[in-house]
């Protein structure tokens, strides 16, 4: 066959669908690889061809569109399963071609099983809610295009295994689930089950997402440096190890990049010649506020090192702060036999 632009296996689009449920999968060529849409391609005389490779096989084979009840069908740039079966798992390829042009891409499709409480290997999207906010909503995801607007589906919401009814601050409102004054106890997996009729059959769509209640922007503050501070002096003798922790609290802020760094005499540690190491640890509160600790370490500190300026810096979307550590050379304790004796006038 003539040359074809092969975009390879698009593992970025690891598509997971539930067994025994409808699935509509758009050919990724038009969404991510080509600059024109399906309608334009079709008008230009290009044909979209689908084929697949079964799990643990190397052989590409055409998709059987002649199954009973049209279980697998194609509509424009969408491959339909009504419904999926476990052995539909594999790599699917869509190819757009005519006599002079060819472009194709493959993508993995995994059909997964779920238990009666909706647990499965499915990777779940995470929806963040702000703590104590008035009303926040999540929407049953990825159900567009499954049924026409004239069809009125029934939607049932679950938290974990339990149907949501008479939950105090969680209210089902059709495709939406409203949270009134969210608390951390609202954390968990929420599932919507959408049931709709089609050609005398009833189909179910199951969608689960994880809700995580996070710190509210109204409570957010600029970074707070807990250490170094004015109460602790790092007093060392030359040759000792100098350890200075920089501990910074960051309020949760959506999409904020939290940074902590040290400067020594105004320079980054990488830009100076002394042998310094920096170790970082990060911990999170239940509302995803973050505490970062960077420990600056000089194994054998010199007199010169003890005269330097060590400053901890922190930055978030809320602002930038800095704090200098108090470092000084320890005055050696007097040796009694010599110094004190001299002090008493002994010779």
């Amino acid at each position: 066959s003539e040359r074809c632009d092969d975009w390879g296996l698009d593992t970025m689009r690891q598509i997971q669908v539930f067994e025994d449920e409808p699935a509509r999968i758009k050919c990724p060529l038009f969404e991510h690889f080509l600059k024109f849409n399906y309608s334009t391609a079709h008008s230009a005389g290009l044909t979209l061809i689908w084929y697949w490779t079964r799990q643990d096989r190397d052989l590409e084979e055409p998709i059987n569109f002649r199954l009973p009840e049209n279980r697998i069908s194609k509509e424009k740039d969408v491959l339909w399963f009504r419904p999926t079966l476990l052995n539909d798992t594999g790599n699917y390829t869509c190819m757009l071609r005519n006599t002079t042009y060819c472009s194709k891409v493959a993508f993995p499709l995994e059909v997964v099983q779920k238990d009666s409480c909706f647990n499965s290997p499915m990777k779940l999207p995470v929806h963040k809610l702000y703590i104590e906010y008035g009303i926040q909503r999540i929407t049953c995801p990825n159900v567009d295009g499954y049924f026409p607007s004239s069809v009125k589906p029934t939607i049932t919401w679950y938290m974990g295994c339990y149907k949501i009814q008479n939950f105090n601050n969680v209210i089902p409102e059709g495709m939406n689930l409203s949270f009134l004054i969210a608390l951390i106890s609202n954390n968990g997996n929420y599932t919507c089950v959408v049931t709709y009729p089609e050609n005398g059959r009833t189909f179910h769509l199951t969608r689960t997402l994880t809700v995580k209640v996070v710190g509210s922007p109204k409570n957010a503050v600029p970074p707070v440096i807990h250490s170094p501070n004015d109460h602790v002096v790092y007093e060392k003798e030359p040759g000792e190890e100098l350890l200075i922790p920089c501990t910074v609290y960051f309020s949760f802020l959506m999409d904020s990049r939290n940074e902590v760094w040290w400067t020594i005499d105004g320079k980054k540690p990488d830009d100076i010649t002394i042998d310094v190491t920096i170790n970082e640890s990060i911990s999170h509160s239940r509302t995803e506020d973050e505490t970062r600790t960077q420990i600056l370490s000089i194994k054998k500190v010199t007199s010169e090192d003890l005269k330097r300026s060590y400053v901890c810096h922190a930055r978030s979307a809320k602002g930038e702060v800095a704090k200098a550590a108090k470092v000084k050379q320890k005055v050696p304790a007097p040796r009694y036999t010599v110094e004190l004796a001299c002090g008493f006038g002994a010779t």
Epitope: E132, Y133, I135, N168, I184, S185, K218
Partner: antibody, heavy 118, light 107 residues
């Protein structure tokens, strides 16, 4: 200094209505969820209602749902409780209380007495 | 709704002695539990939040412990001003609920 001052209590007949107010000062009122908590004579504390800092989210105890409405006016630093269809069992001292998830009900008003009696 | 049960209903203690008050939740409330003190004719006053953190201005003789379903308020050495009713309250789940109270009286 944080202060919460309730008003509007009094004697009302069963089936009647009353509107309680709570004037807040000494803090940024618009940043806090606010609540009403009540205490019947000689009894314990009962949470009645909560409202989010922006006034959008409201929650009620089952015992008052459909009869009481909580609201707030952040421009006036004032919290309200509209009480309709009052019953004898609503007789209590009503407190307004400031709430933040991290510190619970950290400040309370001195309370206002509502008596429902014929 | 989560039911909070306090024990004992009344605790008779001599000044200077230690008082231990218990609070049990009908299901886990994590560490989202507060303790309040109420004296006759006064509003409740926050003592402890987050099960173990003392509120601003509360003396060190008050301490809280526990998590999940079992919580304790300890007053290490009772002063005359500590004789009052103490309430626990969960703020983990709506509706927020209080215990029925423990009255600490002079023995």
């Amino acid at each position: 200094e944080v202060q919460l001052l309730e008003s509007g209590g009094g004697l009302v007949q069963p089936g009647g209505s009353l509107r309680l107010s709570c004037a807040a000062s000494g803090f940024t009122f618009a940043e806090y969820a606010m609540n009403w908590v009540r205490q019947a004579p000689g009894k314990g504390l009962e949470w009645v209602s909560a409202i989010s800092y922006d006034g959008e989210g409201t929650l009620y105890a089952d015992s008052v749902k459909g009869r009481f409405t909580i609201s707030r006016d952040n421009s006036k630093n004032t919290l309200y409780l509209q009480m309709n269809s009052l019953r004898a069992e609503d007789t209590a001292v009503y407190y307004c209380a400031r709430f933040r998830y991290y510190t619970a009900f950290d400040y309370w008003g001195q309370g206002t007495l509502v008596t429902v009696s014929s | 709704e989560i039911v909070m049960t306090q024990s004992p209903a009344t605790l008779s203690v001599s000044p200077g002695e230690r008082a231990t008050l218990s609070c049990r939740a009908s299901q886990s409330v994590s560490s989202n539990l507060a303790w309040y003190q109420q004296k006759p004719g006064q509003a409740p006053r926050l003592l402890i939040y987050g099960a173990s953190t003392r509120a601003t201005g509360i003396p060190a003789r008050f301490s809280g412990s526990g998590s999940g379903t079992e919580f304790t308020l300890t007053i290490s050495s009772l002063q005359s001003e500590d004789f009052a009713v103490y309430y626990c309250q969960q703020y983990n789940n709506w509706p927020w609920t209080f215990g029925q109270g423990t009255k600490v009286e002079i023995k």
